[in-house]
């Protein structure tokens, strides 16, 4: 990737990622410098007859750093702080080639939950107020609520009325997704409204 247009690479929190490096064809490489956010990460001197000299210059990421045979950078056990700009400079006798990358760390979604604040009206209509959440949600998480294949809400919250006298059993499903994972959680309107009805009759007695 040229320095003008960094290659955007997705990594998953806790997993590994490779930043691919392409060599100039037919040229002898003198050394390769890898940088993270403009700070030196590693300095590599290739040798034709023996193993390359690899000098890791960033102790923070050092133990999680590895290099492939073609000197692509491999970073394991990814952390959120690995997010940022990476550059590789390949120096030959005649030129210096620069490759740029932007690493984005995404979380696998975990622990989807639905909270319910529902109420029963005098006419026995049940109004459901449902809120969906996942652990450590960020702006890259999309939420939606579906029932019978229709999207009823595009937000973590759903407000819907359910009348047991005219409605059949109905499940509402929250779907949370990001670029690397998705989770869903279904709730039964009938069950939620029965619970509200029990509370309603308990308080009346």
């Amino acid at each position: 990737q040229s320095s003008l247009t960094p290659l955007m690479v997705n990594g998953i929190l806790g997993e590994s990622v490779t930043l691919p490096l392409e060599f100039p064809a037919g040229e002898k490489v003198n050394f390769i410098t890898w940088l993270f956010n403009e700070t030196s990460l590693a300095f590599i001197v290739p040798h034709e007859t023996k193993s390359p000299e690899i000098h890791v210059t960033n102790p923070k990421q050092g133990k999680r750093l590895n290099f492939t045979q073609s000197y692509s950078l491999q970073l394991s056990n990814l952390k959120m702080e690995d997010t940022g700009s990476y550059r590789a400079q390949i120096s030959t006798k005649t030129s210096a080639k620069l490759s740029s990358y932007t690493l984005r760390i995404l979380r696998q979604l975990r622990n989807i939950q639905v909270t319910n604040h529902s109420q029963l009206f005098q006419n026995m209509t049940c109004e459901l107020h449902l809120t969906c959440s996942v652990e450590d949600a960020d702006d890259n998480v999309s939420f939606r609520w579906e029932a019978l294949g229709n999207t009823l809400s595009s937000q973590p919250n759903l407000t819907v009325s359910w009348d047991p006298r005219i409605s059949s059993e109905q499940d509402y499903t929250c779907i949370a997704e990001n670029a690397v994972s998705n989770l869903s959680f279904s709730v039964s309107a009938q069950k939620l409204c029965e619970d509200v009805k029990i509370q309603y009759t308990d308080t009346k007695m």
Epitope: M8, R144, Q155, N157, T159
Partner: antibody, heavy 118, light 106 residues
Framework: QVQLVQSGSELKKPGASVKVSCKAS????????MNWVRQAPGQGLEWMGW????????RYADDFKGRFVFSLDTSVSTAYLQISSLKAEDTAVYYC???????????WGQGTTVTVSS | QIVLSQSPATLSLSPGERATLSCRAS?????MHWYQQKPGQAPRPWIY???NLASGIPARFSGSGSGTDYTLTISSLEPEDFAVYYC?????????FGGGTKVEIK
Amino acid sequence: QVQLVQSGSELKKPGASVKVSCKASGYTFTNYGMNWVRQAPGQGLEWMGWINTYSGEPRYADDFKGRFVFSLDTSVSTAYLQISSLKAEDTAVYYCARDYGRWYFDVWGQGTTVTVSS
Amino acid sequence: QIVLSQSPATLSLSPGERATLSCRASSSVSHMHWYQQKPGQAPRPWIYATSNLASGIPARFSGSGSGTDYTLTISSLEPEDFAVYYCQQWSSTPRTFGGGTKVEIK
């Protein structure tokens, strides 16, 4: 039917403010996020950000942080976009668009042209 | 942010011809949405989640792709298909649109 109706065109002087409205009908307003999209003359579409119509919490794209404010009046199912300290480069058509999930904009307002000129 | 590059910028074709519109993302995305826009009009939803046609969209339109490469195909152009088409990604904030491909009559 589901529709979004926006307020009419505005001609403003640099430094002034403008408030664009987007009235929703035909669906439960608080169940779907509302997005704002800008289109400068002869240009493409730019996502400005969105507002959670249930909580009222806005989220702005980086280029639209500061002078741009999203707000709501849920009692009349209306979303608003306010732009302050107007500049000539704010001249554009501004669209509101409903998010049907996965940031797919299934219903769009007709657009409001804001012209900033001295 | 994820940059979407649409190509070609302009596609000059005759009615009845096949049109292939490309959208390339600077990073892998899960799905792509497409919109059609005609002069003086608001964009219209066209294809959602890569391959699903929006309500009322004729079957001559199709969408495909994965990762960084997505395509909108019109199997046989009708006069009403000449317009600008935009792709849009949802995987990462900010939600970004491509620069558009204008399909014009040759």
